[in-house]
Amino acid sequence: LRPPRVHNSEENTMRALTLKDILNGTFSYKTFFPNWISGQEYLHQSADNNIVLYNIETGQSYTILSNRTMKSVNASNYGLSPDRQFVYLESDYSKLWRYSYTATYYIYDLSNGEFVRGNELPRPIQYLCWSPVGSKLAYVYQNNIYLKQRPGDPPFQITFNGRENKIFNGIPDWVYEEEMLATKYALWWSPNGKFLAYAEFNDTDIPVIAYSYYGDEQYPRTINIPYPKAGAKNPFVRIFIIDTTYPAYVGPQEVPVPAMIASSDYYFSWLTWVTDERVCLQWLKRVQNVSVLSICDFREDWQTWDCPKTQEHIEESRTGWAGGFFVSTPVFSYDAISYYKIFSDKDGYKHIHYIKDTVENAIQITSGKWEAINIFRVTQDSLFYSSNEFEDYPGRRNIYRISIGSYPPSKKCVTCHLRKERCQYYTASFSDYAKYYALVCYGPGIPISTLHDGRTDQEIKILEENKELENALKNIQLPKEEIKKLEVDEITLWYKMILPPQFDRSKKYPLLIQVYGGPCSQSVRSVFAVNWISYLASKEGMVIALVDGRGTAFQGDKLLYAVYRKLGVYEVEDQITAVRKFIEMGFIDEKRIAIWGWSYGGYVSSLALASGTGLFKCGIAVAPVSSWEYYASVYTERFMGLPTKDDNLEHYKNSTVMARAEYFRNVDYLLIHGTADDNVHFQNSAQIAKALVNAQVDFQAMWYSDQNHGLSGLSTNHLYTHMTHFLKQCFSLSD
């Protein structure tokens, strides 16, 4: 649903996008994800900030918490207890890393309309959650875990060894948060709240990254983070489970690590409860091509957890690393022993498999030269998943239902024909037992969220259709977008091209390549966006291209694992190849080609600029990695192995940006980094700058004091304004 193209007579009433539009978020869209609390009910915060319960079956809506109550403690978030008696209100949000934050929590009794007094929660809390049944509370405070049977009860302290930057209980350390769990928590309730499992991370021996935080004081603070870089000592992880009904009885019981994993450095990758007395743990060797899924059972007689070897399932990759970005997690079926899981099939495509006894005997559920991406829900008779199968576009996502109750299983695409032009990239959110579900369509047209019946797939209502956005865009000259592919030497390079509104193939345009290119990423997606590059096409008349080269995801293992142990080679080659093909199309001014990227994209853009091809006039690297020896162990070693002589040290050294300093002499280079980047440390850009200075190569640079990897707030405006000036100057466009 892009606003319709208009005739020339109307074009004078239409305007181009401005940089201000982008920085103000004028054309941002809304999505609607129901906060499901049962099979047919969800909570949603209304426009006036009341918390409202919607019942799909009865058609009724009930305000359960008033905006007045929310405002009384400045709450920015809430969480309802499963017994519906209490709600936690979250305030004083203080961001830590990507997912983690601390907050103050208040417990409100919905039945009597009062805050729970007595035995109040300490502050600030690192993580808090309700049990899945009733209203028990588990929380993490100062790296220790506490349990409350009821909100007003005194807490029971589960762990005692928590220590800042040393021992983390129930929350991950930096590297596990960013590179393994992708959550702020490391504790998991069993389905009925009988047991609580948690991870303990010991960071005692991990080297510490230290950087200055300038703040406003006379002396800067030093931020210290245990951060294992490639090859360094890693955190040591243990998993414990405690009976929350009688927590003092035997205390936390450690879950044993599979012998084949424990024999050398390893990671814990995820925990999935199957029943109250069965749990599934996933482990990974430090050399991340072997993963073990271990199913453990509670032994009532010994009050311990037993993980028999017969319930260990090994997943191994011979061509790359295990899994995609992460090793996939299992979705268990109702028999509580068999499960569905996505992993590579014999042809090297990620597909859903059904594992009943052994991985070797797995039954393949989906197949084809496309990939299954996520399993949303398994019910008694259906499995819902997403894939990029439809019409062979890897950058699309549709939701499918496979009937598992009947044989042979039948497959139905739930979304493929709903709003075919507007919606080609979906995700979904399911209620209990998949009684109902919400579909969230991200594009390519204006996003729309809808509610559906889980049995019939009938659309019940539109939850959010972004009408205001649609109206706002009616007088905007948006760029045209096209997604196509290049076939080069048996490699398919999908690309997205963003073209100026009055694009004319007979004219020549400056070209900007936007690159990310990291392993298992995907940039060419059929999604809606009005962002900086939209502005550059709409107002400044640039052509922008995004290319998914080798190492990118969802097109099979051949493309994905091509970069294994060789980061920084093929990703760059494929961007260059694509640029040459774009030049051949005839509408690119080959004297005005630029490349830019952020993070991994900054690394690729830097290497592309330093490739010596003469293709690029200028480029920008924002917060780039410059050497893989500087980046996190978990991420880096997954793709590069270890930086040791007997492993892959040679390529670690060959693939640095610094090694190519001389090649920057004939390009205009803008290097940008936040000084408080906890993720890709400022060290990376400092070393590039040092190498360029030592090589006597001129370049431009901008640092953002006290900013992290996201360069947020006012820095964002400054950043995009600065980059715009740089590009316009490079392309000789008047200001």
């Epitope: 047919q40 009930y62 305000t63 008033s66 109550t69 009597n112 309309g113």
Partner: antibody, heavy 120, light 107 residues
Framework: EVQLVESGGGLVKPGGSLRLSCVAS????????MNWVRQAPGKGLEWVGH??????????DYAAPVKGRFTISRDDSKNTLYLHMNSLKTEDTAVYFC???????????WGQGTLVTVSS | DIQMTQSPSSLSASVGDRVTITCRAS??????FNWYQQKPGKAPKLLIY???GLQSGVPSRFSGSGSGTDFTLTISSLQPEDFATYYC?????????FGQGTNLEIK
């Protein structure tokens, strides 16, 4: 502690009117959906009607026997629920209870009831 | 309107007995169904919500089951204080009708 206290019952002639009150305490009255339920002497419970919270639109629903004759209203500033009864009939004789409809679909708290007798 | 048919209308039993009361809805009400207990001269008291949920403070000898149109209240071992009148109620859609009640008396 949640409390509901009804008042206003008494003897009234057929065709007459009466207003019952229910004062609430111990919970957020303004967000509550409030109900009236009655019980004729020696008989079972009969749902009379309810009023939604103002936040949820404040609309009312009534049982067929009282529709058009009874009106439920509320005054959130006074934490009070009302039942305005007009054109009373002898079959309206009952103990009238006010109760809270909690959003897990139950009448979880009840008042002690007030007796209305319609008799000539 | 949804009709609720409760049976039996009265029941004699002894302390320690297992007692079952049933209720049938005239159309499917899923689990929007509750049981109440009322003693003479008192207001009703919620026992079971959502067909099978035990209200806080209610003894575990009371249990509820059913979904759709047929529902059951079971008292596993009658105690002296359980002799009262029991009502079922649907809360699926207004009017929120009650069953006619079951009077449980001492044999």
């Amino acid at each position: 502690e949640v409390q509901l206290v009804e008042s206003g019952g008494g003897l009234v002639k057929p065709g007459g009117s009466l207003r019952l009150s229910c004062v609430a305490s111990g919970f957020t009255f303004s967000l509550a959906w409030m109900n009236w339920v009655r019980q004729a002497p020696g008989k079972g419970l009969e749902w009379v009607g309810h009023i939604k919270s103002r936040a949820d639109g404040g609309s009312t629903d009534y049982a067929a026997p009282v529709k058009g004759r009874f009106t439920i209203s509320r005054d959130d500033s006074k934490n009070t629920l009302y039942l305005h009864m007009n054109s009373l009939k002898t079959e309206d004789t009952a103990v009238y209870f006010c109760s809270r409809f909690y959003w897990n679909y139950v009448l979880d708290y009840w008042g002690q009831g007030t007796l209305v007798t319609v008799s000539s | 309107d949804i009709q609720m048919t409760q049976s039996p209308s009265s029941l004699s039993a002894s302390v320690g007995d297992r007692v079952t009361i049933t209720c049938r809805a005239s159309q499917s009400i899923n689990s929007y169904f509750n049981w109440y207990q009322q003693k003479p001269g008192k207001a009703p008291k919620l026992l079971i919500y959502a067909a099978s949920g035990l209200q806080s403070g209610v003894p575990s000898r009371f249990s509820g089951s059913g979904s759709g149109t047929d529902f059951t209240l079971t008292i596993s071992s009658l105690q002296p204080e359980d002799f009262a009148t029991y009502y079922c109620q649907q809360s699926y859609s207004p009017p929120y009708t009650f069953g006619q009640g079951t009077n449980l008396e001492i044999k």
